[in-house]
């Protein structure tokens, strides 16, 4: 069966910020933001885009020890992100995989708002397991607010665009990113 | 030792909106691993889980009331509440608010361990 | 959503009795399954959880058991402050759902 669980949250983070920092950066900003959450994402194939593989890895005490989650669609223009948990931890048994959307919206008071689907794949009629779906939320929820903090705290970090001289790159005058400054990853 | 009461008007207009809050004392409601919990009880009928709300605001609802309930939480006033839009009589029942036991399995729920002592709602025009 | 199923509805007994009652979950719920006690015009009250385990302040005439989809209550000896309303509660997944009740009543 398919089990669908729908989620809406808030932020106090502009929509292209938080999709830059949380969704495009969430690789290198999760273990250092939420160590207590997340140990270490592993890139195992792909290169962020849709078909990419990673290992998502927890630390002790933790139900699980890790995850894979794969890509399945990036769309810069819309903050949208859809990905689904396809090996490690609830996967098994009774569940053949998770697939979740996450698409963040702009507010009018410059904040934002993060519409969060999680469908639960289950073999046969197996339902799914109440923690299971508090893990994954909670989960979410304490990597939003860890991400929030981080950049309320470093207000310059994944700023928009701004144009960065030729001085400063030690070449020609070019677009750049906050992330690309700082030698971060992207996806 | 926790206990919960629940305050809000005792009778609603079908089309309005119910709004319940339940004050917790004896206890903090930003308590980790802490969720909170509404239930009712229709006249002669069973109990009915509505949904439940961590202390950090996240929300778990029953599907057959999801469209018209919302759960939130004050931990400045170590409140909850519970808002269900769009009542019919059928919507009249005993609201309870609750506690869930948690124990050694982190996100289990084994339990409601503590209960308000139940107010009536009366949804009539 | 998983349905659970009491039996029986109504049960006349008298002091001292030992009374079972039984609890069936549409499917496999473990041992994710608690028992309540309720009383006229009070608050539910939970006796058990985890399908056996015996809450905080709870009289051991109480006990729990089964797993998978067959659950029991048993009252080893009926007391006078016992002639309530039992409810069994699974809590395997959302939305979590409650029996539809057992009422002890005196013989």
């Known amino acids: 069966g398919v089990f669908n669980y729908e989620t809406e949250t808030t932020s106090v983070i502009p929509a292209a910020r938080l999709f830059k920092a949380f969704i495009l950066d969430g690789d290198n900003l999760f273990p250092k933001v939420a160590p207590q959450a997340i140990s270490s994402v592993e890139n195992i194939e792909g290169n962020g885009g849709p078909g990419t593989i990673k290992k998502i890895s927890f630390p002790e005490g933790l139900p699980f020890k890790y995850v894979k989650d794969r890509v399945d669609e990036v769309d810069h223009t819309n903050f949208k992100y859809n990905y689904a948990v396809i090996e490690g931890g609830p996967i098994g048994d009774t569940l053949e995989k998770i697939s979740n959307e996450i698409k963040i919206v702009a507010t009018p008071d410059g904040g934002s708002i993060l519409k969060i689907s999680n469908k639960y794949h289950t073999k046969g009629d197996h339902e799914v397991k109440a923690e299971q779906v508090k893990a994954s939320k909670e989960m979410g929820e304490t990597l939003l607010r860890a991400v929030e903090s981080y950049l309320l705290a470093h207000s310059d970090a994944y700023n928009e665009q701004k144009l960065i001289s030729e001085e400063d790159l030690g070449g020609e005058q070019k677009l750049i990113s906050e992330e690309d400054l700082h030698h971060h990853h992207h996806h | 030792q926790v206990q919960l009461q629940e305050s809000g008007p005792g009778l609603v207009k079908p089309s309005q909106t119910l709004s319940l809050t339940c004050t917790v004392s004896?206890?903090?409601?930003?308590?980790?691993?802490?969720?909170w919990s509404w239930i009712r009880q229709q006249p002669g009928k069973g109990l009915e889980w509505i949904g439940y709300?961590?202390?950090?605001?996240?929300?778990y609802y029953n599907p057959t009331l999801e469209s018209r309930v919302s759960i939130s939480v004050d931990t400045f006033k170590n409140q909850f509440s519970l808002m269900l839009h769009s009542v019919t009589v059928a919507d009249t029942a005993v609201y309870y608010c609750?506690?869930?036991?948690?124990?050694?399995?982190?996100?289990?729920?084994?339990?409601?361990?503590?209960w308000g002592q139940g107010t009536t709602v009366t949804v009539s025009s | 959503d998983i349905q659970l199923t009491q039996s029986p509805p109504f049960l006349s007994a008298s002091v001292g009795d030992r009374v079972t009652i039984t609890c069936w979950a549409s499917?496999?719920?473990?041992?994710?399954l608690a028992w309540y006690q309720q009383n006229p015009g009070k608050s539910p009250k939970l006796l058990i959880y985890?399908?056996?385990t015996l809450h905080t302040g709870v009289p051991s005439r109480f006990s729990g058991s089964g797993s998978g989809t067959e659950f029991t209550l048993t009252i080893s000896s009926l007391q006078p402050e016992d002639f309530a309303t039992f409810y069994c509660?699974?809590?395997?997944?959302?939305?979590?759902?409650f029996g539809p009740g057992t009422k002890v009543d005196i013989k």
């Open positions: 004896g206890g903090s409601i930003s308590s980790a691993d802490h969720y």
């Open positions: 709300i961590s202390y950090r605001g996240t929300t």
């Open positions: 609750a506690k869930v036991l948690q124990g050694l399995v982190r996100f289990r729920d084994y339990g409601f361990d503590v």
């Open positions: 985890d399908a056996f």
């Open positions: 509660q699974h809590l395997y997944s959302f939305p979590f759902t």
């Open positions: 499917q496999d719920i473990s041992s994710y």
